[in-house]
């Protein structure tokens, strides 16, 4: 008799794939054309990335550091109208992309929470949640919550409003903190909050340290659903050495939880890499004409267009990973087990019941080496086979689909491998 299937966990939409942050509409769309109507034309691109949610904005009226001139219910006319926003919501819904609205109040100012008028701002946020929920948004983001006095109680209240409207709505909080205690205390009072932080970026970027950061985080947060990113708003390139970008994409997509990216992460966009760009919002490089001020400043391999045509590009890797993440049960909600491997490596297994299993081996070091996978660390339910099929490598040169002998597996410097193998009773 076949063994009984394990009962599937309840899956919310944000459990099924990545979230994509567009913090600056104008920078995302390119010079001078950034509005909601234009964003509608980029939804096909977001669909091609297989992201499940779009974290948008802030878009509301905000006169720098002026509470009275900050209206969370009004869209800044520079971005478009409420009608444009409604149209965007409808179009996104048709493409199964959820829209999360950033309501961080004083986004143009110094202190994002007008620190001297917290209570009046909190009231504004409450009203805005109800208003935008009625308008059809799928969730909210608030950032810099470490600067919000009594953050935990405010977040609990806002989460109640959000979930009270529908369990299918999401609240994301962002913090610059990388302190695990602080992060855990913010999470404790909010059962379904998704928290983005700088936790993973406080790293020496070695396999051993990353493994310890991830396992400590998972242990501290218990069995709650996590999100994975390197910051609450920034680009991966701002925190990572270039040679680890692909490795981190693979890791963020295969850890248990929701990966959260910023626009441009999929092409390795750099903050202020080009002259005159604001550090916090570099112009998205759609093609070589995206930066007309300086001819030749943008080469094809830096752009969406160029990378779309190159199967070995970072963008192609992102799409491949996003696709796997959104359809494979073991990656969607599978158990997670780390185990010992060679120096500089971080290796783990994702498995769910009798579904195909996944092995991830990440070499953070710049020395090629034997993987040295120590299967003895694993529970009986997650044992390693002698061979596994290569789903992808973060580097060119290996043949996808080829079987690799795990005992003789060798990794290149900075190489990450995603391997699959079947469940065997």
């Amino acid at each position: 008799r076949a063994p009984r299937c394990r009962e599937l966990p309840a899956q919310k939409w944000w459990h099924t794939g990545a979230l994509y942050r567009i913090g600056d509409l104008q920078a995302f769309q390119g010079h001078g054309s950034g509005n909601l109507a234009g964003l509608k034309g980029r939804l096909d691109y977001l669909s091609s990335l297989k992201v499940k949610g779009l974290v948008l904005g802030p878009l509301h009226k905000n006169q720098k550091d002026d509470v009275a001139q900050t209206d969370l219910l009004q869209i800044d006319p520079n971005f478009g109208s409420k009608e444009d926003f409604d149209n965007l919501l409808q179009s996104a819904k048709k493409k199964s992309i959820r829209v999360i609205l950033d309501l961080t109040p004083n986004y143009r100012g110094e202190n994002l929470w007008f620190s001297t008028q917290v209570d009046s701002v909190a009231t504004k946020v409450k009203d805005a949640l109800e208003f935008w929920l009625q308008a059809g948004v799928d969730g909210f983001q608030v950032r810099d919550i470490e600067n919000l006095k009594d953050a935990s109680s405010f977040l609990a209240e806002w989460e109640n409003i959000t979930k009270g409207f529908s369990e299918d709505r999401l609240l994301i909080a962002g913090t610059n903190s990388s302190d695990l205690q602080q992060i855990v205390s913010l999470l404790e009072s909010n059962k379904d909050l998704l928290l983005t932080s700088s936790y993973l970026s406080d790293s020496s970027f070695t396999g051993e340290h990353t493994k310890s950061l991830v396992t400590q985080y998972l242990n501290a947060t218990g069995n709650r659903w996590c999100s994975w990113s390197l910051s609450q708003a920034g680009l991966l390139t701002s925190f990572l050495p270039a040679q680890l970008l692909r490795l981190y994409q693979l890791m963020l997509f295969t850890l248990p939880g929701t990966p959260v990216f910023s626009y441009g992460d999929e092409i390795g966009l750099k903050a202020a890499a080009l002259p005159g760009q604001p550090v916090e919002a570099p112009v998205m490089l759609w093609d070589e004409s995206s930066f007309p001020d300086i001819p030749g400043a943008v080469s094809a391999n830096m752009t969406v267009k160029g990378q779309s045509e190159d199967p070995g590009s970072l963008l192609s890797l992102f799409r491949q990973l996003s696709d796997q993440r959104s359809k494979e049960r073991s990656l969607l909600h599978g158990d997670f087990h780390t185990f010992s491997s060679g120096p500089g490596l971080f290796s783990y297994i994702r498995h769910w019941d009798q579904n195909e299993r996944f092995l991830v081996v990440l070499n953070f070091g710049d020395v090629g080496l034997s993987a040295g996978l120590q299967a003895s660390d694993l529970p009986a339910s997650a044992s390693l086979p002698t061979k596994a099929d290569l789903v992808l490598s973060t580097q060119p040169g290996r043949e996808e689909g080829s079987p690799l002998e795990l005992e003789r597996l060798k990794l290149e410097p900075h190489e990450g491998l995603l391997l699959r193998f079947p469940y065997v009773a």
Partner: antibody
Framework: EVQLVESGGGLVQPGGSLRLSCVAS????????MHWVRQAPGKGLVWVSR????????RYADSVKGRFTISRDNAKNTLYLQMNSLRAEDTAVYYC?????????????WGQGALVTVSS | QSVLTQPPSVSGAPGQRVAISCTGN?????????VHWYQQLPGTAPQLLIY???DRPSGVPDRFSGSKSGTSASLAITGLQAEDEAAYYC???????????FGGGTKLTVL
Amino acid sequence: EVQLVESGGGLVQPGGSLRLSCVASGFTFSSYWMHWVRQAPGKGLVWVSRINSDGSIIRYADSVKGRFTISRDNAKNTLYLQMNSLRAEDTAVYYCVREGRYTGSSLDYWGQGALVTVSS
Amino acid sequence: QSVLTQPPSVSGAPGQRVAISCTGNNSNIGAGYDVHWYQQLPGTAPQLLIYGNSDRPSGVPDRFSGSKSGTSASLAITGLQAEDEAAYYCQSYDSSLTGWVFGGGTKLTVL
């Protein structure tokens, strides 16, 4: 057939400079990390320096740090070693070496070597 | 003084088996970094003989084998032949020196 051909060796006075070149053929040079390894007369092998495929990651042995510079020109399939402030103890045959792929960073192909003699 | 320690010389008669040891520490071989072996025939450049502790590149006879355990590694040559007379070097990576390290070399004499 993989080939690595060094040139630029010779006699130089202490404190002087020399630039070694290594022309690679028979493989996609731009896909491989490269090394320089030296061997003093009658002695063993000593690692000198390493450069990654696009030239963005570089390492040196402590004994040459600050004096030697490794670089590459992928368009010309050429690896370089610029040696300044040369000392008598730098006298050796210098090998240009390719690092293998999927071999645990072994050194899988070696040039024939270029002799550098530092003497007054 | 080399980071990895090898015997300066070994010898054996044709047809015999010889083994060359290579001893490191916990920042190189013992840390889990791979050990590679090179053969240098008189007057020529070194050639890769064993990579990744025990794998042979194509063209290397199966008389040559490598193994690794703890902080040391070993190269074994069976069915010794006159043309095996050469210097043999082990090599690994050292995390404290952040560089590639070699043994001092072992001169093999075929009697």
